[in-house]
């Protein structure tokens, strides 16, 4: 559950459960910075633009990232 304004790190909770790629509007990977010392993965869902924070350490999330990047590379010319 992310915040709607940026204060240090963005996420309130992180999930180990992957989201359904078909329900996904976009997936952002925010690298660690001076504002937040950890990588944050924010999934924006198609329905209501709801944002969900995913645990970058979770195996299931790593698999989701691989699947999404594979799908993107298929689409790119």
């Amino acid at each position: 559950v992310p915040l709607s304004r940026t204060v240090r790190c963005t996420c309130i909770s992180i999930s180990n459960q992957p989201v359904n790629p078909r329900s996904l509007e976009k997936l952002e990977i925010i690298p660690a910075s001076q504002f937040c010392p950890r990588v944050e993965i924010i999934a924006t869902m198609k329905k209501k633009g709801e944002k969900r924070c995913l645990n970058p350490e979770s195996k299931a999330i790593k698999n989701l990232l691989k699947a999404v990047s594979k799908e993107r590379s298929k689409r790119s010319p």
């Epitope: 915040l3 709607s4 790190c9 309130i12 909770s13 999930s15 180990n16 989201v19 645990n55």
Partner: antibody
Framework: QVQLVESGGGVVQPGRSLRLSCAAS????????IHWVRQAPGKGLEWVAV????????FYADSVKGRFTISRDNSKNTLYLQMNSLRAEDTAVYYC????????????WGQGTLVTVSS | NFMLTQPHSVSESPGKTVTISCTGS????????VQWYQQRPGSSPTTVIY?????PSGVPDRFSGSIDSSSNSASLTISGLKTEDEADYYC??????????FGGGTKLTVL
């Protein structure tokens, strides 16, 4: 199974302090944002504060801002609410409640602890 | 400030259907999800509806939720009322996560 157990409530005089604890078990505490919600006797639910999974973000209701501090110790699976400058209107049952990891609702609540502010 | 307003009380007979409304003011109720919590006397709240119309596992399908953008309101409908449904019901949403807003609560009496 998921358990949230609040403690630390009691009777306290106006202007004094109290610290509530919420011991968590049965889930990955270090992944979960946790809220404090209170309920004055015979009244409705009032959101008090929330802390992010890693403690880096904290938000408070206007009614407690500057007086209450939410914190957590992930090594002990425990949430805290430090309440200073207590007022009669802070009298309530205080619940800790966890956010569902992949959604925006409170899927588990503690049994609550009663705080009575009275002279 | 975003606020949620509920009727103070509603009552209905066993077996009938009851609808509890939750009207938003100071913001659009369909911008974010609405949750409904049930609180039986002397107990902690539990979720009966989340994300507008989703039921947690274990909640019977007699409970349903909906959103009406035109009236800026959410509704909780309970069909086939049972005496065990007698409780206080609270809607909850937010304008800015994670600063939450609860409705004032509705006392449901099953006559």
């Amino acid at each position: 199974q998921v358990q949230l157990v609040e403690s630390g409530g009691g009777v306290v005089q106006p202007g004094r302090s109290l610290r509530l604890s919420c011991a968590a078990s049965g889930f990955t505490f270090s992944n979960s944002g946790i809220h404090w919600v209170r309920q004055a006797p015979g009244k409705g639910l009032e959101w008090v504060a929330v802390i992010s999974y890693d403690g880096s973000n904290k938000f408070y209701a206007d009614s407690v801002k500057g007086r209450f501090t939410i914190s957590r110790d992930n090594s002990k699976n425990t949430l805290y609410l430090q309440m200073n400058s207590l007022r009669a209107e802070d009298t309530a049952v205080y619940y800790c409640a966890k956010l569902r990891d992949n959604g925006e609702y409170l899927d588990y609540w503690g049994q609550g602890t009663l705080v009575t502010v009275s002279s | 400030n975003f606020m949620l307003t509920q009727p103070h009380s509603v009552s209905e007979s066993p077996g009938k259907t009851v609808t509890i409304s939750c009207t938003g003011s100071g913001g659009s109720i369909d911008r974010n999800y609405v949750q409904w919590y049930q609180q039986r006397p002397g107990s902690s709240p539990t979720t009966v509806i989340y994300e507008d119309n989703q039921r947690p596992s274990g909640v019977p399908d007699r409970f349903s939720g909906s959103i009406d953008s035109s009236s800026n309101s959410a509704s909780l409908t309970i069909s086939g009322l049972k005496t065990e449904d007698e409780a206080d019901y609270y809607c909850q949403s937010y304008v800015e996560t994670p600063e939450w807003v609860f409705g004032g609560g509705t006392k449901l009496t099953v006559l």
